[in-house]
């Protein structure tokens, strides 16, 4: 209207979706009577009456605002509840007297979007793609107005870059009036991006100011060709026979190429392909010295059929050969001397040790063991250990048995056995000597003989206890080419008062056995009856 002053800018009221907007009519008393006001909403330049105030009393007009409007602040403020994005428009109040004046309010509506949902290309990105590929998507749901998206790589914002980086954003309006933003990051990636961290950030505004939400960080599968191939051996360090050894082919490409591992044949000077497991790993278990040699890996790109060869790697499986001792079966007279010599081969320097088998006592450090003035007790086992000091656990041993010529030697000379009449008695007798003796008994019964070792024999006799046997006792005699020797077993009747309560006498069996280690006196095992204290 000519001569009318230009409309002032509307007052700005900012609210979040779902909250209540307070629309305060800013007409001064001179511009109009606030007890008589009409409220309008303006949409696409069309004004619609939504509320009347008469004599300070409010009345909603039928329509979309009917249920959501009420008067506050003695009629000066119109409250709009449950604000929606569709409420973002101009509202105006118009006073009726003395002159029709209006006051405009611009309602701005805000809603924070949900946390951004980032998705990575599930198939990955090849570095040699001809065009930028879809790297990831970022979706921000239910925001208002449309949030802004910024993509980051390793903490730095990504900018559009011709033929390198392209950000494609689109939005959809939900039935609620809220916006869902989808942003697609397209890029040409390079090998170095395999470890890059990408994320997206949504920037949005609320009445309280500017805010942002970040997605989780993601890495993108990046595919790049193999440039280098190499072999790795596990375990690292010195290998020995018996170890589990893995020879693994590695490449710097993704996905890994197809591998084959071959070993050089020293005689033919040709490489022979080895059988690897499904992962392309050659497993040597147990490793043997024959596995030593030169290995190399060939990597094949199945798309291009181009192959790459690794640097060859020498594998040394350290070993100790079988140990040889000479003489292998020594026999000596008492009082004589003996020299035992130990030999073995190895891929490393060897150390030798001689040990007594029965005691594990170290007798000599070195391959030669000299024994002088041999006694009968010197008979038995001698062990040579050949070891590689630099490789723990790499050793081999050989046992040699020394036999000392001599007549039989009894485990005991005499012994007392407690018995009951008419019981079946199990008696045992042990003797050693070289040549190995045989044992005989002076009474009838069932005898059985068993070798303890080449120089030692144990004989057992089952016999019925009779009065005559009680009278005579039992003798066992051991004999060989060099003489004979006897042990005597005295049988004594036990009377029941000498038994302890837990003694087991129900079997009617008494066992008399000499321990192989006890050379002077006898010990009995199993259900041997206790000796009465009164007998001493």
């Amino acid at each position: 209207v000519p001569g009318e002053a230009e409309q002032p800018a509307p007052e700005l009221v900012e609210v979040e979706v779902g909250s209540t907007a307070l629309l305060k009519c800013g007409l001064s008393q001179s511009q109009g009577n606030l007890s008589h006001v009409d409220w309008f909403s303006v949409h696409k330049e069309k004004r619609t009456l939504i509320f009347r105030v008469r004599q300070g009393q409010g009345q909603s007009e039928p329509g979309e605002y009917e249920q959501r409007l009420s008067l506050q602040d003695r009629g000066a403020t119109l409250a709009l509840t449950q604000v929606t994005p569709q409420d973002e428009r101009i509202f105006l109040c118009q006073g009726k007297r003395p002159r029709s004046q209006e006051y405009r309010i611009q309602l701005r509506v805000y809603k924070a979007p949900e946390e951004p949902n980032i998705q990575v290309n599930p198939l990955g990105i090849p570095v040699n793609s001809k065009e930028p590929e879809e790297v990831a998507t970022c979706v921000g749901r239910n925001g208002y107005p449309i949030p802004q998206v910024i993509w980051y790589k390793n903490g730095r914002p990504l900018k559009e870059e011709k033929n390198r980086v392209h950000i494609q954003s689109s939005q959809t309006v939900e039935s609620s009036g809220l916006y869902t933003l989808q942003s697609i990051l397209k890029a040409q990636l390079v090998k170095e991006d395999k470890d890059a961290q990408f994320y997206c950030e949504l920037n949005y505004r609320l009445p309280s100011g500017n805010h942002m939400k970040e997605s989780r960080e993601v890495t993108v599968p990046v595919f790049y060709p193999t440039e280098k191939v190499w072999l790795e051996v596990e375990p690292v360090g010195m290998l020995k026979e018996g170890d589990r050894v893995e020879i693994r082919c590695l490449a710097d490409g993704n996905p890994p190429p197809h591998f084959s591992i071959s070993k050089g044949n020293p005689s033919t000077r040709e490489a022979e392909e080895e059988t690897t497991n499904d992962n392309g790993v050659l497993v040597l278990e147990p490793a043997r010295k024959e596995h030593s040699g030169r290995y190399e890996c060939q990597a094949w790109n199945l798309d291009t059929m181009i192959s790459l060869l690794s640097e060859p790697q020498e594998l040394l499986v350290n070993y100790v050969s079988d140990v040889r001792v000479s003489p292998a079966a020594p026999e000596r007279q008492e009082g004589s001397s003996l020299t035992l010599t130990c030999e073995a081969e190895s891929s490393q320097d060897l150390e030798f040790q001689w040990l007594r088998e029965e005691t594990d006592q170290v007798l000599e450090r070195g391959p030669v063991l000299q024994l002088h003035d041999l006694k009968r007790e010197a008979g038995g086992g001698y062990r040579c250990v050949a070891s590689v000091p630099s490789i723990p656990g790499l050793n081999r041993t050989q046992l040699v048995k020394l036999a000392i010529f001599g007549p039989p030697w009894m485990a005991f000379k005499e012994r007392k056995v407690w018995v009951k009449e008419n019981m079946v008695l199990n008696l045992s007798c042990e003797a050693s000597g070289h040549p190995r003796p045989t044992i005989s008994w002076n009474v009838n019964g069932t005898a059985s003989e068993g070798d303890q070792d080449p120089q030692r024999v144990l004989s057992t006799l089952n016999v019925l206890v009779t009065p005559e046997l009680l009278e005579t006792g039992v003798e066992c005699t051991a004999s060989n080419d060099l003489g004979k020797n006897t042990s005597i077993l005295f049988l004594e009747l036990v009377n029941l008062t000498t038994l302890t309560p837990d003694s087991n006498t129900t079997t009617g069996l008494s066992t008399s056995t000499a321990s192989p280690h006890t050379r002077a006196n006898s010990t009995s095992t199993e259900r041997k009856l206790p000796e009465p204290e009164s007998r001493g």
């Epitope: 793609s129 001809k130 397209k186």
Partner: antibody, heavy 116, light 106 residues
Framework: QVTLKESGPVLVKPTETLTLTCTVS????????VSWVRQPPGKALEWIAA???????YYNSAFKSRLTISRNTSKSQVVLTMTNMDPVDTATYYC??????????WGQGTLVTVSS | DIQMTQSPSSLSASVGDRVTITCKGS??????LAWFQLKPGKVPKLLIY???SLQTGIPSRFSGSGSGTDFTLTISSLQPEDVATYYC????????FGGGTKVEIK
């Protein structure tokens, strides 16, 4: 309106090569990737191969050595070839559009029977 | 490879019933999950993407929920036209599908 249509032989002999064509309309192959998916009778869906909007190709490693996927952008066609066919490859073969990572539109599928 | 385990393999429900199908991933796939409806001789239909987003044109009785490894497709009120086989699919690393759930009307 987005549509995808698979075409190819209904019957293939064992050891032969299968060639399937997916003809698309309503979008450009330079804007969306396309995947091939199959479903053997009475079994679940199985992804076979894909070609991205940028032209990169991807294969299910279970079939890798037997597959080739390619496209003709001017004809709006994606072609899948599968060599050395076997009766276990009998299935309904579908092509599907990527948006950008899930499949939003599918073809109705074509049943391929492998039999001598 | 990520395995997707769907249950049940089949179900029978009455019209108007609430039907729930579950899908479990062998590892965390965040929200990279879609649900499809397959009917014999028909074009497979995308119902849900990003675990809980309803595809345009799909009735609101279909809804999806879940994140990480456990996901659910719900049909709030089963209709005769919902008889089909339903598949979940992960697109976090490669593409793999669940074994499918056949839905029938009692």
């Amino acid at each position: 309106q987005v549509t995808l249509k698979e075409s190819g032989p209904v019957l293939v002999k064992p050891t032969e090569t299968l060639t399937l064509t997916c003809t698309v309309s309503g979008f450009s192959l330079t804007s969306n990737g396309v995947s091939w998916v199959r479903q053997p009778p009475g079994k679940a869906l199985e992804w076979i191969a894909a070609i991205s909007s940028g032209g990169s190709t991807y294969y299910n490693s279970a079939f890798k050595s037997r597959l080739t996927i390619s496209r003709n952008t001017s004809k709006s066609q994606v072609v899948l070839t599968m060599t050395n066919m076997d009766p276990v490859d009998t299935a309904t073969y579908y092509c599907a559009r990527h948006r950008p990572f899930y499949f939003d539109y599918w073809g109705q599928g074509t049943l391929v029977t492998v039999s001598s | 490879d990520i395995q997707m385990t769907q249950s049940p393999s089949s179900l029978s429900a009455s019209v108007g019933d609430r039907v729930t199908i579950t899908c479990k991933g062998s590892q965390n796939i965040y929200k990279s999950l879609a649900w499809f409806q397959l009917k014999p001789g028909k074009v497979p239909k995308l119902l849900i993407y990003d675990a809980n987003s309803l595809q345009t044109g799909i009735p609101s009785r279909f809804s999806g929920s879940g994140s990480g490894t456990d996901f659910t497709l719900t049909i709030s009120s089963l209709q005769p036209e919902d008889v089909a086989t339903y598949y979940c699919q992960q697109y976090y690393s490669g593409y793999t599908f669940g074994g499918g759930t056949k839905v029938e009307i009692k």
